[in-house]
């Protein structure tokens, strides 16, 4: 079982929409798959998917979950507010038949505000 | 391009532990995502698939020949191993070790094949 | 285990003729998850390692002459040669990857008739 998740960047304007992708792929079938999102270490949501849906629609705060066959889990937050920034790690496990576990690489999402001034003291603030 | 080859002794005598060794070259072993595989073909016959080990190194073997097979990565030398014990004429077979990928979960890369014989 | 039956064991097709080889599976090789099947074809020709033709019961591997395609879903699959060339004699196998242990059908030999 191996998780890719993207992008490992993501700059968006408050009010806007976030995807983050997750791509979940193992070389033999599936029947059911527990996938997790969590934020800054938190859990969102931990839904399963089995024949071909998720259990779980939602995951946390104005966030959306889909699947697209084969592998494209999907996480859709909108309209996003500050709250929104952090650290979102994508984490699947494969239950039947046998388990495996996996996860992404750290997506990191800035929020910018509305305010101009507030998003030009924001970016001074971060190194690099 | 990723290319297999397979190396070890052509015979092995009945009830002694075949030993065959697979070099990669052109990518590396550790790379996420990858089942690194044995398969034998009995002389004129179809291809069993013997088992394989994850870059993760969890192995994973034939039911059938479970009890007497040891796969192993040697990740400094860019190889990975096959153990086969207490072997009979049965064993005789050629030996191909091949790739697989999470993405797939076909054989895309073959290594050429190495003919072991188990005879006293 | 899953087991792989080919039909027929051999087959002998005239050059430029159709050649059709077929595999059937005891039990579906379809995920509702994936929307795929996991069944692979493969070429060997003497002396050589099996070369993979067609991944998902219908994808061409890359460089793989398009006169090779497979088709079928489920349990019952099919590869064909649209129009046979002397390079083509080989024997030709299918595999399933559902789920382990990993099967192979039993072959099917193609010759020119």
């Known amino acids: 079982l191996s998780v890719q998740q993207g992008p490992n960047l993501l700059q968006v304007r408050q009010g806007s929409q976030a995807t983050l992708v997750c791509q979940v792929d193992q070389a033999t079938a599936w029947e059911r798959l527990r996938v997790k999102w969590t934020k800054d270490g938190a859990i969102l949501c931990q839904p399963y998917i089995t024949n071909g849906s998720l259990s779980l629609g939602v995951c946390g705060p104005q966030g959306r979950l889909s699947w697209q066959a084969p592998s494209h889990l999907t996480l859709q937050l909108d309209p996003v507010s500050l709250n929104h920034s952090g650290a979102y790690v994508c984490w699947a496990a494969v239950e039947i038949p046998e388990l495996e576990e996996a996860e992404g690489n750290i997506t990191r999402l800035f929020v910018d505000p509305d305010d101009p001034t507030q998003n030009r003291n924001r970016i001074a603030s971060f190194p690099g | 391009q990723v290319q297999l080859q397979e190396s070890g002794p052509g015979l092995v005598k009945p009830s002694q532990t075949l030993s065959l060794t697979c070099t990669v070259s052109?990518?590396?072993?550790?790379?996420?995502?990858?089942?690194w595989s044995w398969i034998r073909q009995h002389p004129g016959k179809g291809l069993e698939w013997i088992g394989y080990?994850?870059?993760?190194?969890?192995?994973y073997y034939n039911p059938s020949l479970k009890s007497r097979v040891t796969i192993s990565v040697d990740t400094s030398k860019n190889q990975f191993s096959l153990k086969l014990s207490s072997v009979t004429a049965a064993d005789t077979a050629v030996y191909y070790c091949?790739?697989?990928?999470?993405?797939?979960?076909?054989?895309?890369?073959w290594g050429q094949g190495t003919l072991v014989t188990v005879s006293s | 285990d899953i087991v792989m039956t080919q039909s027929p064991d051999s087959l002998a097709v005239s050059l430029g003729e159709r050649a059709t080889i077929n595999c059937k599976s005891s039990?579906?090789?379809?995920?509702?998850?994936?929307?795929?099947?996991?069944l692979a074809w493969y070429q060997q020709k003497p002396g050589q390692p099996p070369k993979l033709l067609i991944y998902h019961a219908s994808t061409r591997e890359s460089g793989v002459p398009d006169r090779f395609s497979g088709s079928g879903s489920g349990t019952d699959f099919t590869l064909t040669i649209s129009s046979l060339q002397a390079e083509d004699v080989a024997v030709y196998y299918c595999q399933q990857h559902y789920e382990t242990p990993l099967t192979f059908g039993q072959g099917t030999r193609l010759e020119i008739k």
């Open positions: 039990q579906s090789l379809f995920s509702s998850n994936t929307k795929r099947n996991y």
């Open positions: 080990i994850y870059t993760s190194g969890r192995t």
């Open positions: 052109g990518f590396s072993i550790t790379t996420g995502g990858y089942y």
């Open positions: 091949a790739d697989m990928a999470d993405k797939g979960g076909w054989f895309a890369y």
